[in-house]
């Protein structure tokens, strides 16, 4: 039992405070911002990560066409309300009592309203399309090698069950990763596709959430895969409800 094993940190979430004061000296970690206990053997929910991020000091054609109902996170960062399990609450409000409904990945799916706005349930995002453009390379990547490497990444780094990586599409320089996970498919202990996509997004931006690990070093047959643009589309089990004004804008 070496000193290295005595390191009380959260390997899957560096935005935590940990101390070995759990039962029998167990290392217990709490997310910054919410103070909620997190399970460091798996990914932390996106809601708790966003909350931690907001509490931290500020610093610095085989391709899929997204459906008309696909959402893009245009609103950016906000300080979310999370439920006791760390999931997004269906209704989110800011300090000025402006409220809106979100999906399971925390992306707004209705027009903004006031405190009277009702969000009856948290609608599940069951399909995520990650759209990447890689930097120019000498030649195109081999599609099957790229597919295998990205599937390995989601399986090993993000612990997402392979069945939830529905497809990897490639038309140089665009790569699309499709994640699909219906409510009925997600078993207890399964990583949520929304959480995996968020960890991937932060990795791609060079803002890894993992403790002490180096940044993401994506290579396909030894060739670095460097991403210069990322767009993520979210499809919900129930289509979003926006007014016509937004849809025609």
């Amino acid at each position: 039992h070496t000193a290295a094993q005595d390191n009380c940190t959260c390997p899957t979430n560096k935005m935590t405070v940990c101390s070995p004061d759990g039962p029998g000296g167990r290392c217990q970690c709490r997310a910054l911002g919410s103070g909620m206990a997190v399970d460091c053997s798996t990914l932390t929910s996106k809601c708790l990560l966003l909350k931690a991020r907001m509490s931290a000091p500020k610093n610095a054609r085989t391709l899929v066409r997204p459906s008309e109902h696909a959402l893009v996170d245009n609103d950016g960062l906000y300080d979310p309300d999370c439920d006791p399990e760390g999931r997004f609450k269906a209704r989110q409000c800011n300090q000025t009592s402006v409220c809106w409904c979100v999906n399971s990945v925390g992306v707004r799916r209705t027009d903004k309203g006031d405190l009277s706005l009702r969000c009856d349930e948290l609608v599940r995002t069951h399909h995520i399309l990650i759209d990447l453009r890689h930097r120019p390379t000498a030649g195109a990547f081999n599609h099957s090698d790229l597919d295998a490497e990205l599937r390995r990444l989601f399986r090993e780094r993000y612990r997402l069950h392979p069945k939830f990586v529905a497809a990897v599409h490639y038309e140089q320089p665009t790569i699309q990763i499709e994640l699909r996970q219906n409510t009925s498919q997600k078993a207890a202990g399964d990583v949520d596709i929304g959480d995996a996509a968020y960890y991937f997004e932060r990795d791609i931006k060079g803002e890894s959430l993992f403790q002490g690990r180096g940044g993401l070093d994506l290579r396909v047959r030894g060739e670095p895969l460097q991403v210069e643009r990322t767009l993520i589309y979210y499809l919900d089990e129930i289509p979003p409800k926006f007014s016509m004004k937004r849809l025609t804008a």
């Epitope: 005595d6 039962p23 029998g24 000296g25």
Partner: antibody, heavy 116, light 107 residues
Framework: QVQLQQSGPEVVKPGASVKMSCKAS????????INWVKQRTGQGLEWIGQ????????HYNKNFKGKATLTADKSSNTAYMQLNSLTSEDSAVYFC?????????WGQGTLVTVSA | DIKMTQSPSSMYAFLGERVTITCKAS??????LSWFQLKPGKSPKSLIY???RLVDGVPSRFSGSGSGQDYSLTISSLDYEDMGIYYC?????????FGGGTKLELK
């Protein structure tokens, strides 16, 4: 190496109090919890409570609330347990143990005898 | 509180024999289980933690296994120095609770 040196045996009268010590060495005292365990002759082990010197947080077995008080002195790397209102039921060997993720290093024990 | 039921409460075994002691928790404890050996006049000795991890310096004849509610400690080939009382401890939640102990004696 990790060592926990406990204070010597105590013979006390019923109704009195006793305070025993557990001096830690070989590691950073504030990085680990100290647990206290009771062993009565011919009986099993009973968990009393846990203190974390790093933040002075503690947890007690409800059976020992009001009976045991756990403290820690960071300057001397010593954990203490005081037992109040002693009765013959409190006659036992008391162990301190440093725990991390269920792995324990134990002190040699302090024998407390409650006798009129 | 989580109740730990240990069995047998006592047993006799020959030197070289394979010995298994079991502990059943009243609810799942997520592998947060330790095993200790206690000898008269000595302090407890840690053998196994996290259900199956062997403590440094403990002979490899000791092993732990189990999951959920059911756990066991096995001594593959009993040695004379293995005589004593064995206890399991759950540390899944407060309060920590010990099993009732298993007294192991030589046949």
């Amino acid at each position: 190496q990790v060592q926990l040196q406990q204070s010597g045996p105590e013979v006390v009268k019923p109704g009195a109090s006793v305070k025993m010590s557990c001096k830690a060495s070989g590691y950073r005292f504030t990085d680990y919890v100290i647990n206290w365990v009771k062993q009565r002759t011919g009986q099993g082990l009973e968990w009393i409570g846990q203190i974390y010197p790093g933040s002075d947080s503690f947890h007690y077995n409800k059976n020992f609330k009001g009976k045991a008080t756990l403290t820690a002195d960071k300057s001397s790397n010593t954990a203490y347990m005081q037992l109040n209102s002693l009765t013959s039921e409190d006659s036992a060997v008391y162990f301190c143990a440093r725990f991390f993720e269920g792995l324990a290093y134990w002190g040699q024990g302090t024998l407390v005898t409650v006798s009129a | 509180d989580i109740k730990m039921t240990q069995s047998p409460s006592s047993m006799y075994a020959f030197l070289g024999e394979r010995v298994t002691i079991t502990c059943k928790a009243s609810q799942g404890i997520n592998n947060y289980l330790s095993w200790f050996q206690l000898k008269p006049g000595k302090s407890p000795k840690s053998l196994i933690y996290r259900a199956n991890r062997l403590v440094d310096g403990v002979p490899s004849r000791f092993s732990g296994s189990g999951s959920g509610q059911d756990y066991s400690l096995t001594i593959s080939s009993l040695d004379y120095e293995d005589m004593g009382i064995y206890y399991c401890l759950q540390y899944d939640e407060f309060p920590l609770t010990f099993g009732g102990g298993t007294k192991l004696e030589l046949k």
